[in-house]
């Protein structure tokens, strides 16, 4: 039986300040059951960037249609990028539980922010 893969195809993405950044993530299976979340950074101090069910993330939108059935594309778009957004972003699959348990992380995508062209 194949193990679930969390695929972040780009190692790095460079975006001009003020533009939007697209961070790609796909999974190879709909199971195990459980949500996907996006974080900036790794370890206990990581910052939650997007979680569909909880929190308010006004600058972050899913790339795929939120009513799409059996979606395996969990890419996100972050609008109005600033230098403070630079860092490595991880797409993380959780196994459903009480609480949910981290199962597998993508390899990460490093976001660098270029100065806005004058």
């Amino acid at each position: 039986e194949e193990e679930l893969q969390v695929i972040q195809p780009e190692k790095s993405v460079s975006v001009a300040a003020g533009d939007s950044a697209t961070l790609n993530c796909t999974v190879s299976s709909l199971i195990p059951v459980g949500p996907i979340q996006w974080f900036r950074g790794a370890g206990p101090g990581r910052e939650l960037i997007y979680n569909l069910k909880e929190g308010h993330f006004p600058r972050v939108t899913p790339v795929s249609d939120p009513t799409k059935r059996n979606n395996m594309d969990f890419s996100i778009r972050i609008s109005n990028i600033t230098p403070a957004d630079a860092g490595t972003y991880y797409c993380v699959k959780f196994r459903k539980g009480s609480p949910d348990v981290e199962l597998k992380s993508g390899a990460g995508t490093e976001l660098s922010v270029r100065a806005k062209p004058s």
């Epitope: 299976s29 709909l30 069910k53 899913p62």
Partner: antibody, heavy 120, light 108 residues
Framework: DVQLVESGGGVVRPGESLRLSCAAS????????MSWVRQAPGEGLEWVST??????YYADSVKGRFTISRDNSKNTLYLQMNSLRAEDTAVYYC???????????????WGLGTLVTVSS | EIVLTQSPATLSVSPGERVTFSCRAS??????IAWYQQKPGQAPRLLIY???SRDTGIPDRFSGSGSGTDFTLTISSLQSEDFGVYYC??????????FGGGTKVEIK
């Protein structure tokens, strides 16, 4: 076309066991969660159990007595039911889970069901 | 556990009439509601998911609406083949998945 065919139902006495099977075809069985939902005679729908990969979830009413499993090489879902009680009498439906958005499962295809009767 | 309350329990309707079913959740379930139709002796059939998205092949006389705790299934013009029981289901917070008690539609 998606097809789900349940088998294994029948009449048993309280305390006995039964194993239900659900043969699936027409979709990539191994990447979908699968569930059992039951319906007591003349009553509404009650979720019983769901399996993802090796992750399993149960209703409190069956926890510790029922075990859900799957064999992806045979495209088959199972429900092992032990210590059966009169209140387990129902039609048991096998259902294919579907997800929408980033979370949440509902049931987009159902089998015709198999009747389990627990009676002394 | 999230409790879903459906009303009314039974509806007696003439073909061609507009029919509205209600499903109320005991807490916020966002838009994570599905609707099913079950005819006597048959398995349930998915009609609507994500509160308002019609499943493939479902006639456009069926529509769903609502978010949070209050949801509605509407049949714009009831056909004779629409008799049966209609169930809502929440999948926002599980286990357990929970279903409403159902609304039975009888043809007048």
């Amino acid at each position: 076309d998606v097809q789900l065919v349940e088998s294994g139902g029948g009449v048993v006495r309280p305390g006995e066991s039964l194993r239900l099977s659900c043969a699936a075809s027409g979709f990539s069985f191994s990447i979908y969660a699968m569930s059992w939902v039951r319906q007591a005679p003349g009553e509404g729908l009650e979720w019983v159990s769901t399996i993802g990969a090796d992750d399993t979830y149960y209703a409190d009413s069956v926890k510790g007595r029922f075990t859900i499993s799957r064999d992806n090489s045979k495209n088959t879902l199972y429900l092992q039911m032990n210590s059966l009680r009169a209140e387990d009498t129902a039609v048991y439906y096998c259902a294919k889970d579907s997800t929408v958005g980033w979370s949440g499962d509902f049931f987009d295809y159902w089998g015709l069901g198999t009747l389990v009767t627990v009676s002394s | 556990e999230i409790v879903l309350t459906q009303s009314p329990a039974t509806l007696s309707v003439s073909p061609g009439e507009r029919v509205t079913f209600s499903c109320r959740a005991s807490q916020n379930v966002r838009s994570d509601i599905a609707w099913y139709q079950q005819k006597p002796g048959q398995a349930p059939r998915l009609l609507i998911y994500a509160a308002s998205s019609r499943d493939t092949g479902i006639p456009d006389r069926f529509s769903g609406s609502g978010s949070g705790t209050d949801f509605t299934l509407t049949i714009s013009s009831l056909q004779s083949e629409d008799f049966g029981v209609y169930y809502c289901q929440q999948y926002y917070d599980w286990p357990p998945f929970t279903f409403g008690g159902g609304t039975k539609v009888e043809i007048k």
